[in-house]
Interface confidence: medium
């Protein structure tokens, strides 16, 4: 079986994940995308997903999470904002193909967030907070219910992520201050 | 084979502004990381910021963010460095250079691996 | 922002030599490092990338290792083109930043 891999990002509360899944773009560009988080020994839970058919860059948010998927690049741009240190835990970007099982699209992404200011300069206590004004979605996006047995992990650490009502603005500290560390498998 | 052309060497003013292009030619353009590095003469590397294009919105060192703007165009597949209010000090080579990434959110994993000619700016009054 | 300090800051070497430069980093940034060269009035080049992994097109003589906050470019055998200025940068988070550099030159 081939191994799966994760990229791990370290962040503050407060700050935004702000990820790309790229996918296959002849096969996928207007397939319905979502945005999964996977729970210790439970099947992965859909937090966001993109319309179906997928549009062509625009922005689906559901609470603090942003999708958008850009056809042209074969990606989907995953964006959570104003982290919680309760959001803490592994994702991953699956591809909707019914009758077929959910394509997962590699790496997964285990996030891990602390509590306490990030102390990166340009983004302190005292600056102006940025804003991202994000138009709200005319359509809801409806996301299938079903899961992929097979993506079941046994030790991912448990965690909530926090859905909330959508929102047509959301402000944002700390939105430059994008952390990636690697992980090698 | 990716290769990024900058635009041409630059004499300016105490006080004045200068504006800095790359252009990319082969490869794709709109999803890797642009960031723009410069050095001064007999200095090391100075990272100023850096845009993913497709994304639109840069990131600034902070010794620069209240004096640079960066900026790209996906049509032409060129982005900019514009310097506002040039001291002597910003007498310096500028380079751009591109950082990718092959996978899930990989933005820049390769580090930043083609890069620029550079660009000669002289601050001079 | 992240600082890194590499050492020593300048080195002189014989062709053949083994060298080692090391880059620490302020606080851990796990494995995003990459390390360049730079000859005089050219722009760097890239030889490694995250952290061990030897870009293309760069001779096997150079390697990285490391991860966190210490990291070390060994070249294994001197050549007489490997003569120039070397850097690492961490891409972990912004801003992106650079060591000070390290001046290899002919004994």
């Known amino acids: 079986a081939t191994k799966l891999t994760e990229e791990k990002y370290e962040l503050k509360e407060g700050q935004t994940l702000d990820v790309k899944c790229d996918y296959t773009l002849e096969k996928f560009a207007s397939s319905q995308k979502a945005w999964q988080i996977i729970r210790d020994g439970e099947m992965p839970k859909t937090l966001a997903c993109t319309e179906r058919p997928s549009k062509n860059s625009h922005p689906v948010q559901v609470g603090r999470i942003i999708l958008e998927d850009y056809h042209d690049h074969g990606l989907l741009r995953v964006r959570m904002v104003n982290l919680q240190v309760e959001d803490s835990g592994l994702y991953q970007c699956v591809i909707y193909q019914p009758p077929k099982e959910p394509h997962m699209l590699f790496d997964r992404i285990r996030l891990v967030v602390t509590k306490g200011f990030s102390g990166t300069p340009g983004s302190n206590e005292n600056s102006t907070q940025n804003v991202y004004k994000i138009p709200p979605t005319t359509t809801k996006a409806l996301c299938p219910l079903y899961t992929s047995p097979r993506t079941v992990t046994q030790a991912p650490p448990k965690s909530t992520a926090d859905v909330s009502t959508p929102d047509s603005e959301i402000n944002l500290t700390n939105v430059t201050d994008i952390i990636r560390v690697p992980v090698f498998n | 084979q990716v290769q990024l052309v900058q635009s041409g060497a630059e004499v300016k003013r105490p006080g004045s502004s200068v504006k800095v292009s790359c252009k990319a030619s082969g490869g794709t353009f709109s999803i890797y990381v642009i960031s723009w590095v410069r050095q001064a003469p007999g200095q090391g590397l100075e990272w100023m910021g850096g845009?993913?294009?497709?994304?639109?919105?840069?990131n600034y060192a902070q010794q620069f963010q209240d004096r640079v703007t960066i900026t790209a165009d996906e049509s032409t597949r060129t982005a900019y460095m514009e310097l506002n209010s040039l001291k002597s000090e910003d007498t310096a080579v500028y380079y751009c250079?591109?950082?990718?990434?092959?996978?899930?959110?990989?933005?820049?994993?390769?580090?930043?691996?083609?890069w620029g000619q550079g660009t000669t700016v002289t601050v001079s009054s | 922002d992240i600082q890194m300090t590499q050492s020593p800051t300048s080195l002189s070497a014989s062709v053949g030599d083994r060298v080692t430069i090391t880059c620490r980093a302020s606080?851990?940034?796990?494995?995003?490092l990459a390390w360049y060269q730079q000859k005089p009035e050219k722009a760097p080049k890239s030889l490694i990338y995250?952290?061990?992994s030897l870009q293309s097109g760069v001779p096997s003589r150079f390697s990285g290792s490391g991860s966190g906050t210490d990291f070390t470019l060994t070249i294994s055998s001197l050549q007489p083109e490997d003569f120039a200025t070397y850097y690492c940068?961490?891409?972990?988070?912004?801003?992106?930043?650079f060591g000070q550099g390290t001046k290899l030159e002919i004994k």
């Open positions: 940068q961490q891409y972990n988070s912004y801003p992106y930043t």
């Open positions: 250079a591109r950082g990718h990434g092959p996978g899930s959110s990989h933005y820049s994993y390769y580090g930043l691996d083609v």
């Open positions: 606080q851990g940034i796990s494995s995003w």
């Open positions: 995250a952290a061990s």
């Open positions: 845009i993913i294009p497709l994304f639109g919105t840069p």
